[in-house]
Interface confidence: medium
């Protein structure tokens, strides 16, 4: 092409028109262009309708183009990634009708001061939304209702003073939330819901530590390993969690998670009873919490409570029965073992009433991996690593999830705009998954002791899985021998809503509790 550079990478025709001092779309671009870079030009205004002839376009970079207006007309049916970062947009165009397949939208570093309620209507496929570095002060309550597949949300570096309580409602796949460097002083009760949030960035806000902060304090305690400090240019999985980075603005930078809450109502941080069944009197011993109540209620949706019941396992069984193919970040341990921090059983456990069904059925048959056929135009090329499809709730184990997307912030000063290093013609919703590994079964029978004052530790090790069994008859404090096969006693089934960033777990895994 006389103006732009054309190249082919992994089945994509990539056209690079960056830094050409263009004021409009160049003529005669290849009709089968799939990735179009128009970064660092002087477009000022741009109409998406001019791209309608490019029916295979899956990624469009319009960052740093001095855009003050984006006209949304026509339809780009397979466009998956739109980068509008580092422009001068004062309002977010309504993209839903024009870009129905959009999975990644980056409007970072513009001049947005507010978002209308229906700003994201029609963007039902959206997985990543980046609004960093704007001038947003508030958000409409139902802003994210149209985007139930959202996985990454960046609202960092704005002027937000408060958040709508239900902002994250229904976002079961959300794994990364960036709220750092705003003017937030509190988090409304119930804000985080009950689903897993593996990566949260909350530092750089003037948190007001009073009785209203107790819900947030408790969430921080329960999710300490999921709270990070943003470092420019560092992959999110390489960062170290740092819950102490969330500091009270009115208490000499005292960490919010340690705020004592003296004089506050006893159940002040319980929030909704669905979210936490809070122990009103607790002693904190470093990372350990001593529970002084005998009822442990787990919500039906998984959340990140790291204080699962404490069980004693035989050392010999761990030596001989740990799975041989552990995830790289998962280590065998001989110490006492609990539920992993990011796993919560899907049941309510009362000490006075617990047994297991008599004949749990073990399984080592993984569900079939989805595959994709060649060739299919790709609706969303920008993700840099394979994402698993939404996990089924059936208990059969499936193959290990693949690595998560490598970065939640594609646009941060002064990094260049995001591009797709390895796009393909594969459709995003059904990637080819690695070969599944049969799930080993632990066969041993130590005693489970459930104490009313059990020590509960957040650090735990995942063991293995079988099919779930129900909770039935009644016993108290200890669980007697049951009429079951001698080597396989019972399991508690858990459900992990979003495991793509979890180093240990597949969504359908559960934990065997031998007796």
């Amino acid at each position: 092409h006389p103006i732009c550079e054309v190249s082919k990478v992994a089945s994509h025709l990539e056209v690079n028109c960056d830094k050409r001092n263009l004021t409009a779309l160049p003529p005669d671009l290849p009709k089968d262009t799939t990735i179009l870079h128009l970064s660092e030009n002087l477009l000022y205004t741009f109409s998406l309708a001019t791209l309608m002839p490019y029916t295979r376009l899956t990624q469009l970079n319009l960052d740093r183009c001095e855009l003050t207006k984006l006209q949304v007309d026509g339809t780009l049916p397979v466009l998956g990634t739109l980068d509008l970062s580092h422009n001068q947009l004062q309002s977010l165009p309504l993209l839903g009708q024009t870009l129905p397949a959009l999975t990644v939208l980056d409007v970072s570093f513009n001049r947005l001061t507010s978002l209308p309620l229906g700003a994201l209507r029609g963007l039902g496929e959206l997985q990543e939304l980046y609004l960093k570095g704007n001038e947003l002060k508030t958000l409409p309550p139902g802003l994210l209702t149209p985007t139930p597949k959202l996985e990454k949300l960046s609202l960092a570096n704005n002027n937000l003073t408060e958040l709508p309580a239900g902002l994250l409602n229904g976002l079961e796949n959300l794994d990364t939330l960036l709220l750092q460097e705003n003017s937030l002083y509190t988090i409304p009760k119930g804000f985080f819901g009950s689903h897993l949030l593996p990566f949260a960035f909350l530092h750089g806000n003037p948190w007001l530590c009073n009785c209203e902060i107790l819900y947030f304090r408790r969430w921080l305690q329960d999710n300490a390993e999921n709270v990070y400090v943003w470092k420019q240019g560092v992959d999110v999985k390489a960062m170290t969690s740092n819950v102490a980075s969330v500091q009270c603005d009115n208490s000499d930078k005292f960490p919010v998670y340690k705020y004592p809450g003296k004089g506050c109502p006893t159940l002040g941080d319980e929030g909704d009873t669905d979210l936490y069944d809070y122990y009103p009197e607790e002693d904190t011993e470093g990372d350990k919490v001593r529970a002084t109540r005998t009822v442990v209620k787990f919500p039906t949706k998984a959340h990140t409570t790291p204080w699962g019941l404490f069980y004693s396992w035989s050392t010999a069984s761990l030596d001989s029965q740990m799975p041989s193919s552990l995830h790289p970040t998962q280590e065998s341990t001989k110490e006492q073992t609990t539920f992993p921090p990011r796993w919560t059983p899907n049941f309510t456990l009362h000490m006075e009433s617990i047994t297991f069904s008599k004949t749990p059925k073990s399984t080592t048959e993984p569900t079939p991996s989805p595959t994709t056929s060649e060739p299919v135009p790709e609706p969303a090329p920008n993700m840099t690593t394979l994402e698993p499809t939404p996990s089924p709730t059936t208990p059969e184990p499936t193959s290990e999830p693949a690595p998560s997307p490598t970065t939640p912030e594609p646009t941060s000063e002064p990094a260049p705009s995001p591009t797709t290093p390895e796009p393909t013609s594969e459709p995003a919703p059904s990637p080819t998954t690695p070969e599944p590994t049969p799930i080993p079964t632990i066969a041993t029978s130590p005693t489970i002791l459930v104490s009313a004052t059990s020590l509960i530790t957040p650090k735990s090790t995942f063991l293995t899985t079988t099919k779930p069994v129900s909770l039935l008859e009644s016993t108290k404090k200890t669980i007697p021998e049951l009429d079951q096969p001698p080597k396989l006693r019972g399991v508690l089934q858990g459900h992990l809503e979003s495991s793509r960033n979890d180093p240990f777990l597949h969504p359908d895994f559960c934990c065997l509790l031998p007796l």
Epitope: V9, A10, S11, K31, E374, T385, T433
Partner: antibody
Framework: EVQLVESGGGLVQPGGSLRLSCAAS????????MSWVRQAPGKGLEWVSS???????YYPDSVLGRFTISRDNSKNTLYLQMNSLRAEDTAVYYC????????????WGQGTLVTVSS | DIQMTQSPSSLSASVGDRVTITCKSS????????????LAWYQQKPGKAPKLLIY???TRESGVPSRFSGSGSGTDFTLTISSLQPEDFATYYC?????????FGQGTKVEIK
């Protein structure tokens, strides 16, 4: 049965021009990317040019500006116009069909020899 | 450009032998989006056009005998002939189909011992 038949090779002087043709049959020609790959005598394979089903051409640096690939879907024919030929362009030129949007070559012609010599 | 390096450049083997040819790329051919490695293998006999054996590292082209298999990931790849047959004596080329310009290895000639 897929068939690719090259023609147009021969002896040409340095600086001269030559046009190669590849007649395709046995498949829907317009739906597939097509390529030229060459092999110098006693040497390995070297990709020369490709054209997508939509008509987008691309080339390696070694022939950029000298060679032009084109296709006539109505005639099921692929072309390679070679200008400013050099001695190092001497090779057997193969016409090859790509699989879908991918860029490996599932069918090859028998090749046509181009000799650039004075 | 991605450089492809094959080894050995030639080898002598007997019918029934297990033969392994390696191919290294100067950068990764793994597309993390779909976990596929964009590498193909071809067989060429003297005076003939190349024939596709394997694509995406390990997928055998239809009609290719099962004794041919491909493996590897990232930058290191292998073509294995489990039991060499008389018709397998030929030159074998790897090709990356990840990023243009498409590049081939220099070839490995498999000769009769």
């Amino acid at each position: 049965e897929v068939q690719l038949v090259e023609s147009g090779g021969g002896l040409v002087q340095p600086g001269g021009s030559l046009r190669l043709s590849c007649a395709a049959s046995g498949f829907t020609f317009s739906s597939f990317a097509m390529s030229w790959v060459r092999q110098a005598p006693g040497k390995g394979l070297e990709w020369v040019s490709s054209i997508t089903s939509a008509g987008t051409p691309y080339y390696p640096d070694s022939v950029l500006g000298r060679f032009t690939i084109s296709r006539d879907n109505s005639k099921n024919t692929l072309y390679l116009q070679m200008n400013s030929l050099r001695a190092e362009d001497t090779a057997v030129y193969y016409c090859a069909k790509s699989r879908g949007y991918e860029d490996y070559f599932d069918y090859w012609g028998q090749g046509t020899l181009v000799t650039v010599s004075s | 450009d991605i450089q492809m390096t094959q080894s050995p450049s030639s080898l002598s083997a007997s019918v029934g032998d297990r033969v392994t040819i390696t191919c290294k790329s100067s950068q990764s051919l793994l597309n993390s989006r779909n976990q596929k490695n964009y590498l193909a293998w071809y067989q060429q006999k003297p005076g003939k056009a190349p024939k596709l054996l394997i694509y995406f590292t390990s997928t055998r082209e239809s009609g290719v005998p099962s004794r041919f298999s491909g493996s590897g990931s990232g930058t290191d790849f292998t073509l294995t002939i489990s039991s060499l047959q008389p018709e397998d004596f030929a030159t074998y080329y790897c090709q990356q189909h990840y990023s243009s310009p498409w590049t081939f290895g220099q070839g490995t000639k498999v000769e009769i011992k």
